[in-house]
Interface confidence: medium
């Protein structure tokens, strides 16, 4: 079957990194600079992706594979194949569509990306709050209130966190 196909279509013999050049009697020609073909039998080579601006080159383009980009420091990838670079925020913040916003009371984010998450509710596990939560850190749960020595005060459990995902106005 392969031999029959080759007789019918000489282009099928052209390997990755080349293209079937109709201007030269369907000879397999190497891809020109800054272009590639990742599969055999192609009639054109694709233009290499250029990683410019906030994008930086993670993998150079070769004759058989496209360049791969990632993001410069202060940004992180979003979308298939890092098609976009989303800005990092500080710890204690989250990135909304309108930019970096501080975590609301009762929530925290210990990373430079992602969203603010509610503090752990220690009382659900029958424990008390040993260390209060902050915008950057979750609460630390300690022993259950019954285990505390007389006179020791437990910290008030955190207020329930707000539901994320309201419409931007």
């Amino acid at each position: 079957f392969e031999r029959t196909r080759s007789l019918q279509d000489p282009c099928s013999n052209c390997p990755a990194g080349t293209f079937c050049d109709n201007n030269r009697n369907q000879i397999c020609s190497p891809c020109p600079p800054n272009s590639f073909s990742s599969a055999g039998g192609q009639r054109t080579c694709d233009i290499c992706r250029q990683c410019k601006g906030v994008f930086r080159t993670r993998k150079e383009c070769s004759s058989t594979s496209n360049a791969e980009c990632d993001c410069t420091p202060g940004f992180h990838c979003l979308g298939a194949g890092c098609s976009m670079c989303e800005q990092d925020c500080k710890q204690g913040q989250e990135l909304t569509k309108k930019g970096c916003k501080d975590c609301c009371f009762g929530t925290f984010n210990d990373q430079k990306r992602g969203i603010c998450r509610p503090w752990t509710n220690c009382s659900l596990d029958g424990k008390s709050v040993l260390v209060n939560g902050t915008k950057e850190r979750d609460v630390v749960c300690g022993p259950s209130p019954a285990d505390l020595s007389p006179g020791a005060s437990s910290v008030t459990p955190p207020a329930p966190a707000r539901e994320p995902g309201h419409s931007p106005q």
Epitope: L78, E86, L95, T96, K97, I115, P164, S167, P168
Partner: nanobody, 124 residues
Framework: EVQLLESGGGLVQLGGSLRLSCAAS????????MTWVRQAPEKGLEWVSS????????YYGDSVKGRFTISRDNSQNTVYLQMNSLRAEDTAVYFC?????????????????WGQGTTVTVSS
Amino acid sequence: EVQLLESGGGLVQLGGSLRLSCAASGFTFSRYAMTWVRQAPEKGLEWVSSISGSGDDTYYGDSVKGRFTISRDNSQNTVYLQMNSLRAEDTAVYFCAKEKAGTTGDYYYNVDVWGQGTTVTVSS
């Protein structure tokens, strides 16, 4: 397979207009909010505009308010971005995105599908 295909980008003069289109396929279009975002060459992602699944509610970033208009045609499975009074700082790759619900959210994690983008260049 869910797909979004943007078109309508190009080179335009300062103060000119362009209309971007985003053709959607592979899902029940009217059930989901849609969003336009953009990426300028030296900047991070910037949210531009969002529209609810019904088309009744629209939202705009401060930098485009009064100049850009988002709309959708649910019979054609297409969302549009009409861009007027274009400025040099509007030069960017514009991406169309599908959100996970009929109403739009504050966060990019509400987005589950991105288009490949269309380039808009505003020249003086």
